[in-house]
C-alpha cells in the first residue's frame, strides 16, 4: 500500500509581508497527479479557496488582488490526486502592514554609538498597542518582537542593545500591532540609521550568551508565536 501523498509547498509572491491594498499571489505546488488544490486559513469556518491546477498540473495559483485584513493569517494548502487528499503543506503566514498608523523609532542616547557601548531603540505609537516589532533591513531573520503580558496596552517599547558591535549598524524600522491579530501590523516607522563607530576593542557577541541580554535583530525569527509570562513588555522567542 502506498504511503501518504507528499505534502505540497506553499509560498507567496512577492513575499509574505504585504502592504494594505497591494496584490499578492499564493502558490501551492504539489505533484503532476494533482486534480485540485485547496487553500485553508487557520481557524476559518470553511475551506478558504479551491483552484484547478495550472498545466502541467503540479501547482495552483491563489490570487489576492488587493490585500486587506480579511486575508492576513496562517495558511496551509492541500492537493487532491486520484487516491485522495495530500498531507497539508507547511504553514504560510501572510502579514498585512498598514493596519494602523506608523510608530516613531528613535535611538537613545543617540543613533551614533561607539562599539562596546549601549544603545536603546525606542518604538513609540500614538495609540496604545500591545505588540512592537523591530526590523533590520537585509538581516536574515529581521525581527525582534516584544509583547505585553495580559494584553496590557502600552505606547512604547524599548529594544536595548548591549554591547553594541559593528553588526548592529544598519537601517531599522519598527511596527506596532494588537495582540488579537499578530498578522496585522501598522505602517512602518520612518527608517532609523544606527551608525556604529569603531573602538580599540570591538567585542563580538558571544554565541552562548543568555537570553536575558539583548540579542541582535538578525538573531530573531520573523513571526514568533511562543510566549512566557512576564510583566510589562518582554521579548518572545519561538
Amino acid at each position: 500500500q502506498a504511503g501518504p501523498l507528499p505534502k505540497p509547498t506553499l509560498w507567496a509572491e512577492p513575499g509574505s509581508v504585504i502592504s494594505w491594498g497591494n496584490s499578492v499571489t499564493i502558490w501551492c505546488q504539489g505533484t503532476l497527479e494533482a486534480r485540485e488544490y485547496r487553500l485553508d486559513k487557520e481557524e476559518s469556518p470553511a475551506p478558504w479557496d479551491r483552484q484547478n491546477p495550472l498545466e502541467p498540473k503540479n501547482k495552483a495559483r491563489f490570487s489576492i488582488p488587493s490585500m486587506t485584513e480579511d486575508y492576513a493569517g496562517r495558511y496551509r494548502c492541500y492537493y487532491r490526486s486520484p487516491v485522495g487528499w495530500s498531507q497539508p503543506s507547511d504553514p504560510l503566514e501572510l502579514v498585512m502592514t498598514g493596519a494602523y498608523s506608523k510608530p516613531t523609532l528613535s535611538a537613545l542616547p543617540s543613533p551614533l554609538v561607539t562599539s562596546g557601548k549601549s544603545v536603546t531603540l525606542l518604538c513609540q505609537s500614538r495609540s496604545p498597542m500591545d505588540t512592537f516589532l523591530l526590523i533590520k533591513e537585509r538581516a536574515a531573520h529581521p525581527l525582534l518582537h516584544l509583547r505585553s503580558e495580559h494584553g496590557a496596552q502600552q505606547h512604547q517599547a524599548e529594544f536595548p542593545m548591549s554591547p553594541v558591535t559593528s553588526v548592529h549598524g544598519g537601517t531599522y524600522r519598527c511596527f506596532s500591532s494588537h495582540g488579537f491579530s499578530h498578522y496585522l501590523l501598522s505602517h512602518p516607522s520612518d527608517p532609523l540609521e544606527l551608525i556604529v563607530s569603531g573602538s580599540l576593542e570591538d567585542p563580538r557577541p558571544s554565541p552562548t550568551r543568555s537570553v536575558s541580554t539583548a540579542a541582535g535583530p538578525e538573531d530573531q525569527p520573523l513571526m514568533p508565536t511562543g510566549s512566557v509570562p512576564h510583566s510589562g513588555l518582554r521579548r518572545h522567542w519561538e
Epitope: E43, P45, A46, P47, W48, D49, T68, W85, F180, S181
Partner: antibody, heavy 122, light 109 residues
Framework: QVQLVESGGGVVQPGRSLRLSCAAS????????IHWVRQAPGKGLEWVAV????????YYADSVKGRFTISRDNSKNTLYLQMNSLRAEDTAVYYC???????????????WGQGTLVTVSS | DAVVTQESALTTSPGETVTVTCRSS?????????ANWVQEKPDHLFTGLIG???NRAPGVPARFSGSLIGDKAALTITGAQTEDEAIYFC?????????FGGGTKLTVL
C-alpha cells in the same frame, strides 16, 4: 434549483436517540459543507454543527458536543445528525443549511430546508 | 461562552437607509468572526444574505451590504423596500463554532 429536505423528527423521551436526515438536490453536494441549525419554539436560531465538504472537518456547539454526531454520505447526497442522550432543551425545529464551497466565493447558510420538529418529552 | 447581541426591533420607512448591528460579548467583532447575515421571512423561510469574505449571495439585491462599524458587525439596507420586512440574524464564528444573535425584527412602514 437548490433543495434541502429534512426528515426524521418526532416525539422522543429524554435520554433516547433520534437520527435526522437532510436530502440535498440541485447542486453538487460533495462540494459543499452543510450545517445543522435549530430553533426552539418562540426562540431565535441556535447553530448546532457543521461538516465540511469531504466529511473530514466537523465542528459542534458546546451544548451538543459529545451527544450529537454530524455525518454525510456524498454518494447519497444526504446529511445526518445522530442525536443521543436527548434532553428537553433539545426540543426545536432542526434545519439543515448549505455552507460555502469556499469562503472567498460564497455565503454560509445561503440555502435552508423547511425544518423537522423534534420534541423531547416524557 | 460568547453571546451575540442585536437590536430586538427596528422600524424604517420605504426608501430610507437602516442599519442592523451585531455585538460580541468577547470584544470587538473582527474579520476573523466572518460575520454572516441571514433573513427570516414568514413561515420560517431562511435565506443567507451576506457572509464569507464580504460576499453577497446570488440574487440578493445590492441594497444589502455588510461591514464592520466600530466594534460591531453591521448589515445596512440602503433604500429599504416593504419586502425587506423580516427578522435578520447575524452569526459570528469563534475559531471552532458559530453563534447566532437573537435576531432583529425589521418593520418597514
Amino acid at each position: 434549483q437548490v433543495q434541502l429536505v429534512e426528515s426524521g423528527g418526532g416525539v422522543v423521551q429524554p435520554g433516547r436517540s433520534l437520527r435526522l436526515s437532510c436530502a440535498a438536490s440541485g447542486f453538487t453536494f460533495s462540494n459543499y459543507g452543510i450545517h445543522w441549525v435549530r430553533q426552539a419554539p418562540g426562540k431565535g436560531l441556535e447553530w448546532v454543527a457543521v461538516i465540511w465538504f469531504d466529511g473530514n472537518n466537523k465542528y459542534y456547539a458546546d451544548s451538543v458536543k459529545g451527544r450529537f454526531t454530524i455525518s454525510r454520505d456524498n454518494s447519497k447526497n444526504t446529511l445526518y445528525l445522530q442525536m443521543n442522550s436527548l434532553r428537553a432543551e433539545d426540543t426545536a425545529v432542526y434545519y439543515c443549511a448549505r455552507d460555502v464551497i469556499t469562503l472567498v466565493r460564497g455565503v454560509p447558510f445561503d440555502y435552508w430546508g423547511q425544518g423537522t420538529l423534534v420534541t423531547v418529552s416524557s | 461562552d460568547a453571546v451575540v447581541t442585536q437590536e430586538s426591533a427596528l422600524t424604517t420607512s420605504p426608501g430610507e437607509t437602516v442599519t442592523v448591528t451585531c455585538r460580541s460579548s468577547t470584544g470587538a467583532v473582527t474579520t476573523s468572526n466572518y460575520a454572516n447575515w441571514v433573513q427570516e421571512k414568514p413561515d420560517h423561510l431562511f435565506t443567507g444574505l451576506i457572509g464569507g469574505i464580504n460576499n453577497r449571495a446570488p440574487g440578493v439585491p445590492a441594497r444589502f451590504s455588510g461591514s464592520l462599524i466600530g466594534d460591531k458587525a453591521a448589515l445596512t439596507i440602503t433604500g429599504a423596500q416593504t419586502e425587506d420586512e423580516a427578522i435578520y440574524f447575524c452569526a459570528l464564528w469563534y475559531s471552532n463554532h458559530w453563534v447566532f444573535g437573537g435576531g432583529t425584527k425589521l418593520t418597514v412602514l
